[in-house]
């Protein structure tokens, strides 16, 4: 069985992640995790200095 691509992305999308489609890539820890463990990043108010939110890259098959 030939292994298909992990992800299908737009031309300007980030490079493919090592995650299977069942998981998301956590940019903060640079690891694949369950997508529910990530939080969608929200825009920060101007001047806010809170730590950067966890973000994810996730393939759409």
């Amino acid at each position: 069985m030939r292994r298909g691509p992990r992800s299908l992305r737009g031309r300007d999308a980030p490079a493919p992640t090592p995650c299977v489609p069942a998981e998301c890539f956590d940019l903060l820890v640079r690891a694949c995790v369950a997508c529910g463990l990530l939080r969608t990043p929200r825009p920060k108010p101007a001047g806010a200095s809170s730590p950067a939110p966890r973000t994810a890259l996730q393939p759409q098959e």
């Epitope: 299977v20 489609p21 694949c32 369950a34 997508c35 463990l37 990530l38 969608t40 759409q60």
Partner: antibody, heavy 118, light 113 residues
């Protein structure tokens, strides 16, 4: 064709240990996550955990219900994936399945039965 | 842990009838960044291992007949069999893979009248 064949089940006494095997064929072993799921007789399925692929350093995730007693590992040279079960209890009696993880639990083996009884 | 609740626990239908079964999760399975619901449906025929039917709540696995349709989002999901065949006799399980531990529903047993 993807093929998963479990073995190693049987009768074991409470407190004992058992190692289940899942022989893999039909795909590149190092390139897929592999999971274990169990099903007590007449009951629903319970996910036990999985081991990620080579690209992810073969890291593992476990169900807290078995973490510390069960260990998932793999021998890629022989295309075998293992479930080491320690300190077994009566409630661990079940059919144990291995499954390939990709979009969800994509392909399943036929299962091997474990009975924990004195 | 996310609790998955399926209903009904069993149902009996005649060949050719339409069947719907429900799966509810204790929290949303929708990941807003990609609009995917991390829910799968499996079919387990008597004496066999489970088989993946649907992933991402509504995407049919390759080779699965188009009479099987998954729908829903967030916490409420449905599996529909448009015209039941005798070979559809099985237990159907939903499963979330939104977070660890992955959890399954208790199953819906489909019997043929």
């Amino acid at each position: 064709e993807v093929k998963l064949v479990e073995s190693g089940g049987g009768l074991v006494q409470p407190g004992g240990s058992l190692r289940l095997s899942c022989a893999i064929s039909g795909f590149t072993v190092t390139a897929y996550y592999m999971s274990w799921v169990r099903q007590p007789p007449g009951k629903a399925l319970e996910w036990l955990g999985f081991i990620r692929d080579k690209a992810n350093g073969y890291t593992t995730e476990y169900n807290p219900s078995v973490k510390g007693r069960f260990t998932i590992s793999r021998d890629n040279s022989q295309s075998i994936f293992y479930l080491q079960m320690n300190t077994l209890r009566a409630e661990d009696s079940a059919t144990y399945y291995c499954a390939q993880v990709r979009r969800a639990l994509d392909y399943w083996g036929q299962g091997t039965t474990v009975t924990v009884s004195a | 842990d996310i609790v998955m609740s399926q209903s009904p626990s069993s149902l009996a239908v005649s060949v050719g009838e339409k069947v719907t079964m429900s799966c509810k999760s204790s929290q949303s399975l929708l990941y807003s960044s990609n609009q995917n619901n991390y829910l799968a449906w499996y079919q387990q025929k008597p004496g066999q291992s489970p088989k993946l039917l649907i992933y991402w709540a509504s995407t049919r696995e390759s080779g699965v007949p188009d009479r099987f349709t998954g729908s829903g989002s967030g916490t409420d999901f449905t599996l529909t069999i448009s015209s039941v065949k005798a070979e559809d006799l099985a237990v159907y399980y939903c499963q979330q893979y939104y977070t660890y531990p992955y959890t399954f529903g208790g199953g819906t047993k489909l019997e043929i009248k």
